[in-house]
Every structure is written in C-alpha cells, then in structure tokens.
C-alpha cells in the first residue's frame, strides 16, 4: 500500500536517465504516491489469515491495513486487516489492496487515472534478496540539468543517490524523491516484519549509516500497543 | 546563505486580486520544491500550495483550490501565488518556504489584509 | 479544517523538560512515521527544529529531541532555556487530501 515501506530501507539499483550514469546501491525507489507494486504477492486468503498486532499500517504487509478489529472499537487495540478490494469503503490508501486507492471513501482502481500522475523516468527496483521487481511507471517531473554538473544537497531533488552528494541518498518525500541525509545512530528508520512485504511509500528514509542496522527500539520491546518504530542501532 | 524575500502584500478589497512573489538566493532554485504557507493575525500556521521543482506539478489546500495559482520562474530564481476571488478569511501572513526536507528555509512573509 | 491536535499552552521553569504532544487521526499522523515540529518566536518565520520523527537539521540543539507512537507525536525539550519560549507546530501529511498539515499550536513558556 501507498504505507508500505521498502525491505530492510534497501533503497537500491534504479536505471539511468537516457545517458545518465547508473545509480548505485543506495538510490530510491520512486513513484507516485498510491502507484502500487502490481506484481509478486500472492494475497492472503481469510482461511490462513493471522492476526497480527500493529500500531500503523507500516508494520503490516502490503495486502494489510492497521486498524481496529471492531467498528468503534478500542483505538489501542489494533490489528493488521486484509485489504479491502476495488468499491469497498475506505479512509485512507492504506486500507485498499494493490493497485487500488482510496477516493472518496471507496477503494478505486489506481490505472483509472494515472493517480496522483506525475511520475518520465522508468523504473526497475530490486528489493533486498528478494529480487521482485517493480513495473515501470512513466514521471512527468523532469530534474534541472544543472543536477547533473552539480551533487545535490539535503532536500534538493534527485533520481538516484549519485545525484546526491556524499552522506545523502535520494529518497522519496511527498510528491518527488529528493537527497535525504543517510540515518546516523538513533534516528528512526523502515523495517518491514515480512520479507517480501515492501511496496512504495511517500516518506522513504535512507538507509542506516556504516555500521549501524535498522532493529526495533529496545524500549518498545515490552510494550504491547508500542509503534514498534525501528532506530538505526550499532551492530 | 539561503535567502528568501516576499513581496506584494497588501490592503485589498473581497472579490479582488493580488500576486505575491518570492525572490529567492542562495541556493540552486530551481532544484527545490517551494510552498505557500499562511498564517492569520495571531492563529496557527496553515499550508496553502506547492510547486514541483520544474513547474509540473501543483497541489494546493482545498480552502483555496479554484482561487490560487502558484507558478514559479525558475530563470529569475523567483515564486509567485496570483490570488483572486479575496476572501476576508485569506487575511494572513504569507510566508514563502523551501520545501526541502519538509519547510527548511522561510522567508520573513508579506501581509495580505482583505478588508472593504 | 483538518488539522493535528496540540495543547494551546505548556510550560515549564529553565533547566526542566518538557513534551508537548500532537495528536492526528490514522488517515495523517497515524498512518505515516513521519512528523515534523517548527518553532516560531514572535514576529518571526517558522524555523524547522525536528523532520521525519526524530531527525534534527544541523545547527538544531540536541535539547530538541522528537518521537512517536500511533496516533501521537511528541516534541521534548530538555534543560530548558529563556530562548525556548515561542510557539511549536506539528506537521505531517493527511492522505485523503493529499496536503500538508499543521497543528494547530502550542504557546511554551519559560517560567521565571
């Protein structure tokens, strides 16, 4: 879903621009918000469907959504819910299934209207060990050529890390990917509790920094109803 | 150092017009993402729109969809809000900002008071 | 108006701590790791202090620390100064709209 997060931060290999140099580990996947991953998860079916406690739909798979299991029920009690497919009720993006957003309060399919449309250059993604891959998706938002001559700084917009100065990757924020610090010790950053659970988010951080891994916060270990956020942690 | 200057601002009268520009130094313009951001005599902050870093792209609050138009130039390194159809409740500060990693940079704002 | 929850005022004497909280709905805040605080002395522009939960800029004290968890976000201050005292804004994105929001506030005082 559009909450969904890439594997393990692995922000990887993305294609040049015609004649550009290719991106090195470390680039962005991008596209539109709500322009979802349409291949390689096979949904879950209600029969083998486990409950699983969450307090954001980050922690849950790409065919999930966190909410309460009940109408009305106890906020703090939260579960990771299948999907709901095309002119189902939603609130949000995360709720619709793959290739499907939320529009006024109805899952609709996201190829109805090229949504959010603006993403020329096409992009294959290689996830972490998973080698899926992501279906192109055509940008309109072109980048100055002035990026090409000059790395980018922090907040300035990119294709790829290499378009990023050192320390920097390109990751998406909002509406484009722009050069985001890499993570230092202690900063949050995205881990997903399923291999194979990524898909494309609107707020990408970077990887973790040398030497540091993304691991859940020590602290929310014991809570039950904790956000489960995952810190950049020494080895 | 990053530099952002708005200008424009003003007493205008409902039903009328006004453009704000923004001139900004400092740094490379036209890689950056640039917003609108008001804020009305002594309330909170409000988010008005936002200009891709090439001009093709555009979002705006739905409170002033239909009414604004933010456009940018990136050859004079300048931001622009054209604001038609004034209401008394577009009284505000309007702070130009450099939508970075988030609003990293703003300028001092323009004072727009809609009033007959 | 679709906007984050914050106390209208908190306060606090120098050297103390204090969180102020911002409060969203799953659709914003709740939905996204991802918050951002400002804050803004009289007169003066917006100054971002906190991005994605708990990441400062650089030249922003690490008195200012940021965190999150469901629904809510908390900004904290630490060893708390005269120079703190000025309003604080959370924001974040609300998917419906697909906008930027802020909160709606919160006067810090430093007592004394």
């Known amino acids: 879903t559009l909450n969904s997060v890439l594997n393990s931060n692995a922000i990887k290999n993305l294609p040049p621009p015609l004649g550009g140099a290719a991106g090195h580990p470390g680039s962005a996947v991008s596209a539109a918000p709500g322009i979802l991953y349409p291949g390689g998860n096979k949904y879950q079916t209600i029969d083998n469907y486990q409950p699983y406690p969450c307090a954001e739909d980050e922690e849950c798979g790409t065919d999930e959504y966190c909410a309460s299991p009940t109408r009305g029920g106890d906020a703090g009690v939260q579960i990771c819910l299948a999907c709901r497919k095309r002119r189902k009720r939603c609130m949000r993006h995360a709720m619709c299934c793959p290739g499907n957003y939320c529009k006024n309060g109805i899952c609709v399919s996201s190829d109805q209207n090229n949504f959010r449309g603006e993403i020329e250059e096409t992009i294959t993604e290689s996830f972490g060990n998973d080698h899926s891959t992501l279906d192109g998706y055509s940008r309109r938002t072109t980048l100055s050529s002035k990026m090409y001559h000059s790395k980018g700084q922090e907040g300035s917009v990119c294709l790829r890390s290499s378009d990023c100065a050192t320390g920097l990757c390109c990751a998406r924020h909002f509406w484009s990917k722009i050069c985001k610090p890499v993570l230092k010790e202690g900063q949050v950053c995205t881990k997903h509790r399923r291999k194979g659970s990524h898909g494309l988010e609107i707020f990408q951080r970077c990887y973790c920094g040398e030497g540091l891994s993304c691991r859940i916060q020590k602290d929310h270990h014991q809570a039950s109803n904790s956000s489960r956020l995952h810190t950049c942690q020494r080895h | 150092q990053v530099q952002l200057v708005e200008s424009g601002g003003g007493l205008v009268q409902p039903g009328g017009s006004l453009r704000l520009s923004c001139a900004a130094s400092g740094f490379t313009f036209s890689s950056y993402w640039m917003s609108w951001v008001r804020q009305a005599p002594g309330k909170g902050l409000e988010w008005v729109s936002v200009?891709?870093?090439?001009?093709?792209?555009?979002y705006y609050a739905d409170s002033v969809k239909g009414r604004f138009t933010i456009s940018r130039d990136n050859s004079k390194n300048t931001l622009y809000l054209q604001m038609n159809s004034l209401r008394a409740e577009d009284t505000a500060v309007y702070y130009c900002?450099?939508?970075?990693?988030?609003?990293?940079?703003w300028g001092q704002g323009t004072l727009v008071t809609v009033s007959s | 108006d679709i906007a984050l929850t914050q106390p209208a005022s908190v306060s606090g004497s120098p050297g103390q701590s204090i969180t102020i909280s911002c409060t969203g709905t799953?659709?914003?805040?709740?939905?996204?790791?991802?918050v951002s605080w400002y804050q803004q002395h009289p007169g003066k522009a917006p100054k971002l202090m906190i991005y994605?939960?708990?990441n400062r800029p650089s030249g922003v004290s690490n008195r200012f620390s940021g965190s999150k968890s469901g629904n809510t976000a908390s900004l904290t201050i630490s060893g708390l100064q005269a120079e703190d005292e000025a309003d604080y804004y959370c924001?974040?994105?609300?998917?419906?709209?697909?906008?930027?929001?802020f909160g709606g506030g919160t006067k810090l005082t430093v007592l004394g």
């Open positions: 200009i891709s870093s090439d001009s093709s792209s555009t």
């Open positions: 924001q974040s994105y609300d998917s419906p709209t697909d906008s930027v929001v």
């Open positions: 994605d939960v708990n």
């Open positions: 900002a450099r939508h970075g990693i988030d609003f990293d940079h």
């Open positions: 799953s659709s914003d805040l709740g939905g996204y790791n991802y």
